[in-house]
Interface confidence: low
Amino acid sequence: QPSVSPGEPSPPSIHPGKSDLIVRVGDEIRLLCTDPGFVKWTFEILDETNENKQNEWITEKAEATNTGKYTCTNKHGLSNSIYVFVRDPAKLFLVDRSLYGKEDNDTLVRCPLTDPEVTNYSLKGCQGKPLPKDLRFIPDPKAGIMIKSVKRAYHRLCLHCSVDQEGKSVLSEKFILKVRPAFKAVPVVSVSKASYLLREGEEFTVTCTIKDVSSSVYSTWKRENSQTKLQEKYNSWHHGDFNYERQATLTISSARVNDSGVFMCYANNTFGSANVTTTLEVVDKGFINIFPMINTTVFVNDGENVDLIVEYEAFPKPEHQQWIYMNRTFTDKWEDYPKSENESNIRYVSELHLTRLKGTEGGTYTFLVSNSDVNAAIAFNVYVNTKPEILTYDRLVNGMLQCVAAGFPEPTIDWYFCPGTEQRCSASVLPVDVQTLNSSGPPFGKLVVQSSIDSSAFKHNGTVECKAYNDVGKTSAYFNFAFKGNNKEQIHPHTLFTP
């Protein structure tokens, strides 16, 4: 019993004066609390609490359920306790079968004993099954059996409290342990689509999937740089014991341009946080933007191939595409395909394959595309580079020698004189006149050049070479002539093509 110091309040005194009392079932429990400032007796066992304002607590016929802690309290708030065991061979345990344990924490199997003198107070698995090897416990006859450091693997474990009574094992009612998992990783968050593009008035709906070990994970949709609470709807599932999934769906029934922005799905647990974002762009009307993948002015050599390639953004999706040349629509030789198979893709590619182009096939090639809101077009100017071709080579009545050549880019014409029978013409002759002529072909066709020299300057037999060249190649034409007496005689002109 507590000793009393004068002048200072002391705890109440209890009779019998011991910390533990054992009585048999059916016997009387008589507890006396002595204190001038007595307030009450309190009885506690498991979740049950009773109070008594009499200073003497009397239970005429004790039952096993009267086992517990009896506390007397005075007006100073000081108290003293005695623990009473009501020994009942037919009811060795008092039980509260609810059993929850937090992973990595301790949890109490609440099966206090009515008889502290039984032996081997421990836990056993149901139906003779052994307990997990790593399960450690500490028995306390007044409280129950404490399982140390609960593991996730113990979830749904079936247990009995057990004692030995007169050489026999006696089991309590069964307990099923429910383990609440600890968070050991941040939640896993994903979003149905990383970006959304909508027209005004269309519905915006995006779903965030949050995965974690339990439903106590917190999640929310937030608008970046805004505190406004967003309206969400939730669905959730438990896929097995520690595999929880939540779907948080954010909806704006009629999106407006000013709803555009970044939306974040944020989730956190006691381990940490994770987030994922999606971008919404709302436009007042659809659009098409075309991006040429090659220069819109194209130079290609005669006989070679060229691919005219465009990428374009179209929203809503494109409905009509065509390639046109000289008011004629291509029915084949082109393909159009999405840049990505992603469902949010708005970028497309169109390719026109021009093969073995001729000099006559230069010109404007136009790509046209439309959707329900807009039309767009882009033009490519295709120039076909061709080696010069000598169209005419003549001696004129006025004594001029004239050479006309066509090609692209514009050919240059040089003149050479070869005296006598020499094969190589090296002495250059300056032209009298050079003109670029208008071609009768299409605007992107060959350019025609005419050049003239005065043959009266030649006093000897020989050959005149007209050489037309550009970046692609060269072609020569030769004119032979000879003197007969005082007359210069024209011999048939001939053209030799040199590689």
Partner: antibody
Framework: QVKLQESGGGLVQPGGSLRLSCAAS????????MSWVRQAPGKGLEWVSY????????YYVDSVKGRFTISRDNAKNSLYLQMNSLRDEDTAVYYC??????????????WGRGTLVTVSS | QSALTQDPAVSVALGQTVRITCQGD??????ASWYQQKPGQAPLLVMY???IRPSGIPDRFSGSSSGNSASLTITGAQAEDEADYYC???????????FGGGTKLTVL
Amino acid sequence: QVKLQESGGGLVQPGGSLRLSCAASGFTFDSYAMSWVRQAPGKGLEWVSYITSSSSTIYYVDSVKGRFTISRDNAKNSLYLQMNSLRDEDTAVYYCARLRNSEGYWYFDLWGRGTLVTVSS
Amino acid sequence: QSALTQDPAVSVALGQTVRITCQGDSLRSYFASWYQQKPGQAPLLVMYGQNIRPSGIPDRFSGSSSGNSASLTITGAQAEDEADYYCNSRDSSYNHWVFGGGTKLTVL
């Protein structure tokens, strides 16, 4: 000075074992998750293993599962990697790295100089 | 584990801007971190999260993320920026980490 220092590398035959150590100094070691990252000669970085500050959670890359064991001794400010059944493809410089999570962003913010493990017959 | 894909090599003229990219499914869920590694040295963290630079990293380094892609941009590249750059993120399975194959940056 905040520092990580690896040791224990060397030449070992295929099938052999090696134990790497990493000594931490200058910071509260028992507050941080740690990892091992390796880099084969002339190749890129490869994450190998992860351990939480209290050793409660451990992860391994698939290629070392069942062969490597990560552990730590917070009292000694040390991280370990026990490597068994070593293969030629385990040849690499092994780095000890501190792994942080800040507001859900993961990053390795402190690295050791590395220790070379050569597996060859 | 899922992979992160980087261009093996990128070059940039001194003082110009260069962008190093990293792609992979895990980047739809997790932010990338970026590491610089010079020959014979340990990697150095240069960027993480949504464009967060550790102290001591020059502000010419910036990062961005979109869809399944992340990028590290160096605006006004210096000779000392020549190095291997690695991206890293948590794997889609969340209990692994994965590095990109690395990009060798040459400053001309």
